[in-house]
């Protein structure tokens, strides 16, 4: 039975050229990560896996960094960038665990970041 | 020596679908992403997807979402691909290559290609 | 997606000869960009990546050089064995996209 669940910085807003960190922590399993995807829709961002450690997309390679820990932080934030993000969980023996982060990219100077919320 | 042994030719119907298997041999099968490439005559080399064996994660090129279907079994160290509602346009050499984990992104080893020709 | 275009389909030279083969792209890949050989049995082989490096095992008569949207591949001293067709590929962006592919004969 999976009885984890997934918490994320949820609604999140920053500005256009700034940089963010997108974080999901999985509580509440036993279970053992082995495996967590960064996705935008269904466009690979970045993957940590436990064995092979970090490979990020090329289509992301200049302007995402690993980390901190199995968070990604995006960089030279575009209005592009607005949408949602998807940290997939990889576990065993649970299986896979989905965490729902939304970005607004703004053109102002004024960003504010929402609150956290959690994923069952 | 690394090797990747792709199955034989086919001939298929319009309508039918085809697995084209990919047998690795020489390297750490699960350490490396399975790239698939089709070429046709007059169409050059076409980048259809990827899988990284072991994780399950797949990705693919738009143009090719419906159409194919990776797969891999680390046991056997052989990975798969799954064309289905073949048409004329399917006709075609496969190829699968090779390409490290991490961020490396080149297909360093390729497999000798398997040609599919769809003809009622 | 990023269209790769090499201009020249064919080509021929004489044994010995230096050859440059030409790819661009429609827009700037950061060198971002690897090459080819494949070989009239369907062989496919890396020659050189991210622009310029030289793939092990390969010959050091196969040179890469280019930046922004315009790369180039030589061979400084052409060999019967050389006799393939030529590809490009950028990794600026996914997915990943081939040039069309220069076949290199010897006159």
């Known amino acids: 039975m999976m009885t984890g669940t997934i918490e994320t910085t949820g609604n999140i807003s920053a500005e256009k050229g700034g940089s963010i960190i997108l974080q999901c922590h999985l509580s509440s399993t036993t279970a053992q990560v082995t495996q967590v995807n960064w996705e935008q829709q269904d466009q690979l961002l970045a993957i940590c896996n436990a064995d092979l450690g970090w490979h990020i997309s090329p289509s992301f390679k200049d302007r995402v960094a690993p980390g901190p820990g199995l968070g990604l932080t995006l960089q030279s934030l575009t209005v592009n960038d607005t949408g949602e993000y998807f940290c997939i969980y990889h576990t065993y023996p649970d299986g896979t665990y989905t965490g729902r982060i939304f970005l607004e990219v703004l053109e102002s100077s004024v960003a504010e970041h929402g609150a956290r919320f959690q994923i069952p | 020596q690394v090797q990747l042994q792709q199955s034989g030719g086919d001939l298929m119907k319009p309508g039918a679908s085809v697995k084209i298997s990919c047998k690795a041999t020489g390297y750490t099968f699960s350490n490396y992403w399975i790239e698939w490439v089709k070429q046709r005559p007059g169409h050059g080399l076409e980048w259809i997807g990827e899988?990284?064996?072991?994780?399950?994660?797949?990705y693919y090129n738009e143009k090719f979402k419906g159409k194919a279907i990776f797969t891999a079994d680390t046991s056997s160290s052989t990975a798969y691909m799954q064309l289905s509602s073949l048409t004329s346009e399917d006709s075609a050499v496969y190829y699968c290559?090779?390409?490290?984990?991490?961020?490396?992104?080149?297909?360093?080893?390729w497999g000798q290609g398997t040609s599919l020709t769809v003809s009622s | 997606d990023i269209q790769m275009t090499q201009t020249t389909s064919s080509l021929s030279a004489s044994l010995g000869d230096r050859v440059t083969i030409s790819c661009s792209a429609s827009q700037g890949l950061s060198n971002y960009l690897h090459w080819y050989q494949q070989k009239p049995d369907g062989t496919v082989k890396l020659l050189i990546y991210y622009t310029s490096s030289l793939h092990s095992g390969v010959p050091s008569r196969f040179s890469g050089s280019g930046s922004g949207t315009d790369y180039s591949l030589t061979i400084s001293n052409l060999e019967p064995e050389d006799i393939a067709t030529y590809y490009c590929q950028q990794y600026s962006k996914l997915p990943y996209t081939f040039g069309g592919g220069t076949k290199l004969e010897i006159k």
């Open positions: 899988i990284l064996p072991g994780s399950g994660s797949s």
């Open positions: 290559a090779r390409q490290k984990y991490g961020n490396y992104y080149y297909f360093d080893f």
